[in-house]
């Protein structure tokens, strides 16, 4: 399992460490989740050839994974702090159902999958404290999420492997874009 934020293995031990600021906590939290995703991707790629597959588009049609676009205000051109923060939080909330799907998809990295899921919940809480306009954040409908989860779990083995790969890849992309955007705030 990855080292929890605040005990980052990259840190040099400091005798009197300052408490982390809000921005630093968020940055570390995202890096921590990204490290977890890297470990999960390793298992996925070692277990199947999904990481080299050219048939991603087939599976991608079944998924509606959050993506950053220029209109979301998170890119440097047209950057808008409030719009972007709403997009990041909304996107993370939308990813939660997909992270739930990942929970039974790993053998040797089961703990890691749980750590990614729980750390994402903590990240959402950090970001919600930072957001001024919480009304603009739409929470996914639990009934819709439940039926999506059932649908994903009913796929054949190949599609399930591909779905796992795509979720990890998309979540990594989303977090990387979020990390850059949050550094501008």
């Amino acid at each position: 399992a990855p080292v929890p934020p605040g005990e980052d293995s990259k840190d040099v031990a400091a005798p009197h460490r300052q408490p982390l600021t809000s921005s630093e906590r968020i940055d570390k939290q995202i890096r921590y989740i990204l490290d977890g995703i890297s470990a999960l991707r390793k298992e996925t790629c070692n277990k199947s050839n999904m990481c080299e597959s050219s048939k991603e588009a087939l599976a991608e049609n079944n998924l509606n994974l959050p993506k950053m676009a220029e209109k979301d205000g998170c890119f440097q051109s047209g950057f808008n702090e409030e719009t972007c923060l709403v997009k990041i939080i909304t996107g993370l909330l939308e990813f939660e159902v997909y992270l739930e799907y990942l929970q039974n998809r790993f053998e040797s990295s089961e703990e890691q999958a749980r750590a990614v899921q729980m750390s994402t919940k903590v990240l959402i809480q950090f970001l919600q404290k930072k957001a001024k306009n919480l009304d603009a954040i739409t929470t996914p409908d639990p009934t819709t999420n439940a039926s999506l989860l059932t649908k994903l779990q009913a796929q054949n083995q190949w599609l399930q492997d591909m779905t796992t790969h795509l979720i990890l890849r998309s979540f990594k992309e989303f977090l990387q874009s979020s990390l850059r955007a949050l550094r501008q705030m």
Partner: antibody, heavy 120, light 106 residues
């Protein structure tokens, strides 16, 4: 193995537009987290970061030069192009392109550089 | 925009000496800092990333430390092949380089 190579004119006239191409191999700019950046170094001076472009077409520019710079990518050709308009003698420098990978964001592979002189 | 102040601008030390270079950011950059080595006529080479991580193939005599706004680069035992200019660079927003430190042998 990762390689990057800069190409373009060695001499540019003042007020013209300088266009430089970075051709790379060993990685793809369609891979999430991948970035190619441009850095320059006037003779005997320090490194100056100019711009970089991410795999998803997000672009960052040096604020001091933002109005004069444009960066674009051609993923199929493994190329990134930097354009700088209205050049002057102060733009004489060695121009480097470099790769950044993933969220640790350090330039881990560099081209050998191309010396561009701005003179009439 | 965040400014990087690197010091000293140059230093002279003997082979085997411990060499320290510092880089100060105008605001917290949360350990998003890299150190590079550049030899005359060559492209820079990455030595340290994320403030403390040694890049692949870099000798262990090089190290980085620091957090917040203050960062340090250390060569534990200076070797003749370490003669070069060293730069820091941050990655919090738009990433400028420090002004560089030229390391020479006495």
């Amino acid at each position: 193995q990762v390689t990057l190579r800069e190409s373009g004119p060695a001499l540019v006239r003042p007020t013209q537009t300088l266009t430089l191409t970075c051709t790379f191999s060993g990685f793809s700019l369609s891979t999430s987290g991948m970035t190619v950046g441009w850095i320059r170094q006037p003779p005997g001076e320090a490194l100056e970061w100019l711009a970089h472009i991410w795999w998803n077409d997000d672009k960052y520019y040096n604020p001091a030069l933002k109005g004069r710079l444009a960066v674009s990518k051609d993923t199929s050709k493994n190329q990134v192009v930097l354009s700088m308009n209205t050049v002057g003698p102060g733009d004489t420098a060695t121009y480097y392109c470099a790769r950044m990978e993933d969220y640790d964001e350090a330039m881990d592979y560099w081209g050998q550089g191309i010396l561009v002189t701005v003179s009439s | 925009d965040i400014q990087m102040t690197q010091s000293p601008s140059s230093l002279s030390a003997s082979v085997g000496d411990r060499v320290t270079i510092t880089c100060r950011a105008s605001e917290n950059i949360y350990s998003n800092l890299a150190w590079y080595q550049q030899k005359p006529g060559k492209a820079p080479k990455l030595l340290i990333y994320a403030a403390t991580y040694l890049a692949d193939g870099v000798p262990s005599r090089f190290s980085g430390s620091g957090s917040g706004t203050d960062y340090t680069f250390t060569i534990s035992s200076l070797q003749p092949e370490d003669i070069a200019t060293y730069y820091c660079q941050h990655f919090w927003g738009t990433p400028p380089f420090g002004q560089g430190t030229k390391v020479e042998i006495k």
